[in-house]
Protein backbone atom coordinates (compact mmCIF):
# COMPACT_ATOMS: atom_id res chain seq x y z
CA UNK A 1 0.00 0.00 0.00
CA UNK A 2 1.39 3.62 -0.91
CA UNK A 3 1.19 5.80 1.60
CA UNK A 4 3.15 8.42 0.66
CA UNK A 5 2.35 11.99 -0.16
CA UNK A 6 3.80 14.50 -2.57
CA UNK A 7 4.60 18.25 -1.48
CA UNK A 8 5.51 20.35 -4.53
CA UNK A 9 6.14 23.96 -4.83
CA UNK A 10 2.26 24.44 -6.84
CA UNK A 11 1.56 26.78 -9.18
CA UNK A 12 4.55 29.09 -9.19
CA UNK A 13 5.17 32.11 -11.79
CA UNK A 14 9.18 33.79 -12.70
CA UNK A 15 10.35 36.29 -14.79
CA UNK A 16 11.04 35.80 -18.14
CA UNK A 17 15.29 35.69 -18.00
CA UNK A 18 15.15 34.70 -14.67
CA UNK A 19 15.30 30.83 -13.14
CA UNK A 20 13.26 29.05 -11.17
CA UNK A 21 13.86 26.06 -8.36
CA UNK A 22 11.49 23.16 -8.78
CA UNK A 23 11.19 20.96 -5.92
CA UNK A 24 9.50 17.81 -4.90
CA UNK A 25 8.97 16.40 -1.47
CA UNK A 26 7.97 13.06 -0.71
CA UNK A 27 6.37 12.44 2.61
CA UNK A 28 4.91 9.86 5.10
CA UNK A 29 6.34 7.58 3.79
CA UNK A 30 9.87 4.95 4.83
CA UNK A 31 10.09 3.49 1.14
CA UNK A 32 13.71 4.23 -0.28
CA UNK A 33 13.63 6.64 -3.27
CA UNK A 34 15.73 5.13 -5.77
CA UNK A 35 15.46 7.69 -8.83
CA UNK A 36 13.76 10.72 -9.58
CA UNK A 37 12.89 11.24 -12.81
CA UNK A 38 11.61 15.49 -13.78
CA UNK A 39 9.64 15.98 -16.51
CA UNK A 40 7.60 18.58 -19.03
CA UNK A 41 4.55 17.16 -20.92
CA UNK A 42 6.32 14.48 -22.20
CA UNK A 43 9.97 15.82 -22.51
CA UNK A 44 12.22 14.02 -20.36
CA UNK A 45 13.99 17.22 -18.38
CA UNK A 46 16.40 15.82 -15.91
CA UNK A 47 17.01 12.14 -13.87
CA UNK A 48 18.66 12.12 -10.06
CA UNK A 49 19.39 8.68 -9.53
CA UNK A 50 20.50 8.11 -5.20
CA UNK A 51 24.19 6.90 -6.14
CA UNK A 52 24.73 7.70 -9.67
CA UNK A 53 23.64 11.39 -9.91
CA UNK A 54 22.37 13.87 -12.54
CA UNK A 55 21.75 13.20 -15.94
CA UNK A 56 20.46 16.18 -17.91
CA UNK A 57 18.73 15.16 -21.80
CA UNK A 58 21.10 17.34 -24.07
CA UNK A 59 17.87 19.52 -25.60
CA UNK A 60 17.92 21.02 -21.71
CA UNK A 61 21.68 20.74 -20.71
CA UNK A 62 21.88 24.69 -21.45
CA UNK A 63 19.16 25.85 -19.72
CA UNK A 64 18.85 23.45 -16.99
CA UNK A 65 21.26 23.01 -13.28
CA UNK A 66 20.70 19.90 -11.34
CA UNK A 67 19.84 20.91 -7.55
CA UNK A 68 19.49 21.61 -4.70
CA UNK A 69 18.83 18.20 -3.70
CA UNK A 70 16.64 16.17 -5.67
CA UNK A 71 15.29 19.70 -7.56
CA UNK A 72 15.76 21.28 -11.23
CA UNK A 73 16.88 24.51 -11.49
CA UNK A 74 15.22 26.45 -14.72
CA UNK A 75 17.33 29.02 -16.03
CA UNK A 76 17.06 31.59 -18.68
CA UNK A 77 13.18 31.29 -18.74
CA UNK A 78 11.17 31.96 -21.82
CA UNK A 79 7.64 32.07 -22.21
CA UNK A 80 7.30 28.54 -24.07
CA UNK A 81 8.65 27.26 -20.57
CA UNK A 82 5.12 28.09 -19.30
CA UNK A 83 3.23 24.25 -18.88
CA UNK A 84 2.94 21.62 -16.37
CA UNK A 85 6.19 20.48 -15.25
CA UNK A 86 6.32 16.45 -13.18
CA UNK A 87 8.79 14.99 -10.26
CA UNK A 88 8.17 11.18 -11.29
CA UNK A 89 9.92 9.43 -7.91
CA UNK A 90 10.25 5.99 -8.34
CA UNK A 91 10.85 4.02 -4.65
CA UNK A 92 11.57 0.27 -3.62
CA UNK A 93 8.72 -1.21 -2.03
CA UNK A 94 6.25 1.85 -3.01
CA UNK A 95 6.63 2.03 -7.09
CA UNK A 96 6.16 5.73 -8.46
CA UNK A 97 4.75 8.87 -6.62
CA UNK A 98 4.13 11.79 -9.46
CA UNK A 99 4.09 15.48 -8.44
CA UNK A 100 3.15 18.45 -10.34
CA UNK A 101 4.39 21.83 -10.99
CA UNK A 102 2.67 23.92 -13.09
CA UNK A 103 5.39 27.31 -13.81
CA UNK A 104 3.70 30.63 -15.58
CA UNK A 105 6.70 32.82 -17.03
CA UNK A 106 5.68 36.45 -17.19
CA UNK A 107 7.21 38.89 -19.49
CA UNK A 108 6.37 41.71 -16.88
CA UNK A 109 7.83 42.22 -13.18
CA UNK A 110 5.18 40.97 -10.73
CA UNK A 111 5.66 37.14 -10.67
CA UNK A 112 4.96 36.03 -7.54
CA UNK A 113 5.49 32.44 -5.95
CA UNK A 114 2.03 30.36 -5.49
CA UNK A 115 0.62 28.64 -2.62
CA UNK A 116 2.98 25.06 -1.85
CA UNK A 117 -0.05 22.34 -2.23
CA UNK A 118 -0.17 18.68 -1.60
CA UNK A 119 -0.82 15.72 -3.79
CA UNK A 120 -1.37 12.30 -1.94
CA UNK B 1 43.49 10.17 -23.07
CA UNK B 2 41.42 8.06 -21.18
CA UNK B 3 41.98 4.74 -20.76
CA UNK B 4 40.43 1.43 -19.19
CA UNK B 5 42.85 -1.48 -19.06
CA UNK B 6 40.81 -4.27 -17.22
CA UNK B 7 42.71 -7.43 -15.85
CA UNK B 8 43.32 -10.75 -17.72
CA UNK B 9 40.98 -13.60 -18.25
CA UNK B 10 40.14 -15.82 -15.08
CA UNK B 11 39.08 -19.88 -15.20
CA UNK B 12 36.94 -20.34 -11.77
CA UNK B 13 35.42 -23.28 -10.53
CA UNK B 14 31.01 -22.75 -9.63
CA UNK B 15 30.49 -21.64 -6.58
CA UNK B 16 33.73 -19.57 -6.41
CA UNK B 17 34.07 -15.80 -6.65
CA UNK B 18 36.24 -13.58 -9.56
CA UNK B 19 36.82 -10.17 -8.53
CA UNK B 20 37.84 -8.28 -12.10
CA UNK B 21 39.94 -4.63 -12.17
CA UNK B 22 39.70 -2.07 -14.43
CA UNK B 23 42.55 0.67 -13.67
CA UNK B 24 41.62 3.81 -15.17
CA UNK B 25 43.84 6.80 -16.20
CA UNK B 26 43.11 10.22 -18.07
CA UNK B 27 40.62 11.88 -16.25
CA UNK B 28 39.61 12.81 -12.81
CA UNK B 29 38.31 9.34 -11.86
CA UNK B 30 36.22 10.38 -8.25
CA UNK B 31 34.15 12.88 -10.80
CA UNK B 32 32.44 10.16 -12.92
CA UNK B 33 30.57 6.87 -12.12
CA UNK B 34 31.89 3.98 -13.22
CA UNK B 35 29.66 0.52 -14.71
CA UNK B 36 29.87 -3.28 -15.52
CA UNK B 37 28.22 -4.33 -18.45
CA UNK B 38 28.36 -8.28 -19.36
CA UNK B 39 28.08 -10.27 -22.53
CA UNK B 40 27.93 -13.78 -22.80
CA UNK B 41 29.70 -14.96 -26.46
CA UNK B 42 27.91 -14.18 -28.82
CA UNK B 43 24.98 -12.81 -26.71
CA UNK B 44 23.75 -9.07 -26.08
CA UNK B 45 24.72 -6.63 -23.12
CA UNK B 46 23.59 -6.97 -20.23
CA UNK B 47 24.00 -4.50 -17.25
CA UNK B 48 24.93 -5.47 -14.17
CA UNK B 49 25.14 -2.04 -12.05
CA UNK B 50 27.16 1.03 -11.50
CA UNK B 51 29.53 3.01 -8.51
CA UNK B 52 30.15 6.38 -7.51
CA UNK B 53 33.48 6.61 -7.41
CA UNK B 54 33.18 9.46 -4.91
CA UNK B 55 30.50 8.63 -2.54
CA UNK B 56 31.15 4.56 -3.00
CA UNK B 57 27.64 4.80 -3.62
CA UNK B 58 26.16 2.14 -5.82
CA UNK B 59 22.91 0.53 -7.79
CA UNK B 60 22.61 -2.56 -8.62
CA UNK B 61 20.75 -4.80 -11.16
CA UNK B 62 18.28 -6.64 -9.18
CA UNK B 63 19.38 -10.03 -10.84
CA UNK B 64 22.76 -9.71 -9.44
CA UNK B 65 22.12 -8.21 -6.27
CA UNK B 66 23.47 -9.96 -3.05
CA UNK B 67 26.05 -11.54 -6.05
CA UNK B 68 27.62 -8.59 -6.97
CA UNK B 69 29.69 -6.05 -5.26
CA UNK B 70 31.20 -2.75 -6.60
CA UNK B 71 34.47 -1.14 -4.93
CA UNK B 72 36.64 1.58 -5.91
CA UNK B 73 40.42 2.98 -5.00
CA UNK B 74 40.28 5.97 -5.43
CA UNK B 75 44.36 5.89 -4.51
CA UNK B 76 44.90 3.78 -7.47
CA UNK B 77 42.03 5.36 -9.91
CA UNK B 78 40.71 1.57 -10.18
CA UNK B 79 36.99 0.22 -10.04
CA UNK B 80 36.54 -3.25 -9.14
CA UNK B 81 33.71 -5.76 -10.26
CA UNK B 82 33.51 -9.43 -7.29
CA UNK B 83 30.92 -11.76 -8.60
CA UNK B 84 30.43 -14.67 -5.97
CA UNK B 85 28.79 -17.93 -6.11
CA UNK B 86 29.87 -18.49 -9.72
CA UNK B 87 27.59 -20.77 -12.06
CA UNK B 88 28.40 -21.80 -15.78
CA UNK B 89 26.28 -19.07 -16.90
CA UNK B 90 28.48 -16.81 -15.13
CA UNK B 91 30.85 -17.33 -18.24
CA UNK B 92 31.10 -14.41 -20.00
CA UNK B 93 32.95 -11.26 -20.75
CA UNK B 94 32.66 -8.15 -18.37
CA UNK B 95 33.12 -4.68 -19.24
CA UNK B 96 34.03 -1.71 -17.22
CA UNK B 97 32.41 1.73 -18.58
CA UNK B 98 32.56 4.88 -17.77
CA UNK B 99 29.86 7.59 -18.39
CA UNK B 100 29.44 11.34 -19.91
CA UNK B 101 29.48 13.61 -17.52
CA UNK B 102 25.95 14.18 -16.37
CA UNK B 103 24.53 12.39 -18.89
CA UNK B 104 23.90 8.53 -18.35
CA UNK B 105 25.61 7.03 -21.48
CA UNK B 106 29.03 5.14 -21.59
CA UNK B 107 31.62 6.72 -23.33
CA UNK B 108 34.76 4.57 -22.90
CA UNK B 109 34.92 0.49 -22.51
CA UNK B 110 37.53 -1.36 -20.96
CA UNK B 111 38.61 -3.85 -23.24
CA UNK B 112 36.66 -6.81 -21.24
CA UNK B 113 37.61 -9.50 -18.88
CA UNK B 114 37.31 -13.01 -19.87
CA UNK B 115 35.81 -15.07 -16.36
CA UNK B 116 34.96 -19.02 -17.27
CA UNK B 117 33.45 -21.21 -14.81
CA UNK B 118 34.23 -24.78 -15.65
CA UNK B 119 34.65 -28.03 -13.20
CA UNK C 1 12.47 -4.46 -16.19
CA UNK C 2 11.92 -2.51 -19.55
CA UNK C 3 12.06 -4.62 -22.04
CA UNK C 4 13.98 -3.40 -25.70
CA UNK C 5 13.21 -5.18 -28.70
CA UNK C 6 15.36 -4.92 -31.63
CA UNK C 7 14.34 -5.93 -35.25
CA UNK C 8 15.58 -7.69 -37.53
CA UNK C 9 17.74 -9.75 -35.86
CA UNK C 10 20.00 -9.14 -38.44
CA UNK C 11 20.44 -7.17 -41.62
CA UNK C 12 22.13 -7.98 -45.18
CA UNK C 13 22.57 -4.39 -47.13
CA UNK C 14 24.35 -3.12 -50.04
CA UNK C 15 27.00 -1.07 -50.18
CA UNK C 16 26.02 2.86 -50.29
CA UNK C 17 22.68 1.31 -49.19
CA UNK C 18 20.59 2.48 -46.61
CA UNK C 19 20.33 0.18 -43.39
CA UNK C 20 17.13 0.63 -40.96
CA UNK C 21 17.29 -0.88 -37.30
CA UNK C 22 14.30 -0.57 -34.69
CA UNK C 23 14.13 -1.09 -31.23
CA UNK C 24 10.98 -0.95 -29.18
CA UNK C 25 10.82 -0.37 -25.87
CA UNK C 26 7.77 -2.17 -23.56
CA UNK C 27 7.16 0.72 -22.09
CA UNK C 28 7.59 5.05 -22.12
CA UNK C 29 11.22 5.99 -22.05
CA UNK C 30 10.90 8.87 -23.14
CA UNK C 31 14.11 10.13 -24.95
CA UNK C 32 16.44 7.76 -22.72
CA UNK C 33 17.86 5.52 -25.41
CA UNK C 34 21.72 5.48 -27.00
CA UNK C 35 22.64 3.17 -29.84
CA UNK C 36 25.51 1.22 -29.53
CA UNK C 37 28.36 -0.63 -31.98
CA UNK C 38 30.30 -3.77 -31.78
CA UNK C 39 32.79 -5.19 -33.81
CA UNK C 40 33.82 -8.65 -32.99
CA UNK C 41 36.32 -8.67 -29.97
CA UNK C 42 35.71 -4.89 -29.50
CA UNK C 43 34.01 -3.24 -26.99
CA UNK C 44 30.85 -1.21 -28.17
CA UNK C 45 31.26 2.06 -29.05
CA UNK C 46 28.80 5.18 -28.46
CA UNK C 47 26.98 6.13 -31.84
CA UNK C 48 23.65 7.70 -30.83
CA UNK C 49 22.46 9.48 -27.34
CA UNK C 50 19.14 10.81 -26.08
CA UNK C 51 17.86 8.89 -28.95
CA UNK C 52 19.29 11.57 -31.22
CA UNK C 53 22.85 13.20 -30.71
CA UNK C 54 25.06 11.84 -32.64
CA UNK C 55 28.06 11.19 -30.30
CA UNK C 56 31.60 13.16 -31.02
CA UNK C 57 32.99 12.11 -34.33
CA UNK C 58 30.29 9.71 -35.28
CA UNK C 59 29.88 9.94 -39.45
CA UNK C 60 27.00 11.72 -40.22
CA UNK C 61 25.47 8.85 -42.04
CA UNK C 62 24.23 7.23 -38.37
CA UNK C 63 21.30 8.95 -37.10
CA UNK C 64 18.53 8.18 -34.57
CA UNK C 65 15.41 8.98 -34.17
CA UNK C 66 12.17 8.31 -32.06
CA UNK C 67 10.78 8.86 -28.54
CA UNK C 68 8.23 7.00 -26.38
CA UNK C 69 8.63 3.35 -27.19
CA UNK C 70 9.94 3.69 -30.42
CA UNK C 71 13.55 4.39 -31.71
CA UNK C 72 15.16 3.75 -35.26
CA UNK C 73 18.57 3.76 -35.93
CA UNK C 74 19.53 4.72 -39.43
CA UNK C 75 23.11 4.33 -41.39
CA UNK C 76 22.37 6.25 -44.73
CA UNK C 77 24.46 4.85 -46.98
CA UNK C 78 26.28 1.59 -45.72
CA UNK C 79 30.18 1.51 -45.71
CA UNK C 80 32.32 -1.44 -45.10
CA UNK C 81 33.31 -0.35 -41.77
CA UNK C 82 30.15 -0.38 -40.42
CA UNK C 83 29.53 -4.04 -40.59
CA UNK C 84 28.93 -4.80 -36.73
CA UNK C 85 26.02 -5.57 -34.38
CA UNK C 86 24.70 -2.43 -33.28
CA UNK C 87 22.42 -2.55 -29.52
CA UNK C 88 19.88 0.15 -28.50
CA UNK C 89 19.99 0.73 -24.77
CA UNK C 90 17.27 2.73 -21.96
CA UNK C 91 18.48 4.45 -19.45
CA UNK C 92 14.99 5.83 -18.04
CA UNK C 93 14.98 3.45 -14.87
CA UNK C 94 17.23 1.22 -13.70
CA UNK C 95 17.87 -1.22 -14.20
CA UNK C 96 19.22 0.08 -17.59
CA UNK C 97 18.48 -2.51 -20.14
CA UNK C 98 19.60 -3.31 -23.83
CA UNK C 99 17.92 -4.49 -27.00
CA UNK C 100 19.31 -8.34 -28.14
CA UNK C 101 21.19 -6.40 -31.02
CA UNK C 102 21.08 -6.50 -34.66
CA UNK C 103 24.00 -7.62 -37.26
CA UNK C 104 24.16 -5.65 -39.94
CA UNK C 105 26.09 -7.60 -43.09
CA UNK C 106 27.35 -6.36 -46.69
CA UNK C 107 24.93 -8.13 -48.94
Known amino acids: MMTGTIETTGNISAEKGGSIILQCHLSSTTAQVTQVNWEQQDQLLAICNADLGWHISPSFKDRVAPGPGLGLTLQSLTVNDTGEYFCIYHTYPDGTYTGRIFLEVLESSVAEHGARFQIP | QVQLVQSGAEVKKPGASVKVSCKTS????????MHWVRQAPGQGLEWMGGINPNTGGTTYNQKFQGRVTLTVDKSSSTAYMELSRLRSDDTVVYYC????????????WGQGTLVTVSS | DIVMTQSPDSLAVSLGERATINCKASQDVRTAVAWYQQKPGQPPKLLIY???YRYTGVPDRFSGSGSGTDFTLTISSLQAEDVAVYYCHQHYITPWTFGGGTKVEIK
Open chain 3, 50 to 52: SAS
Open chain 2, 97 to 108: AKLLRLMYYFDY
Open chain 2, 26 to 33: GYAFTEYT
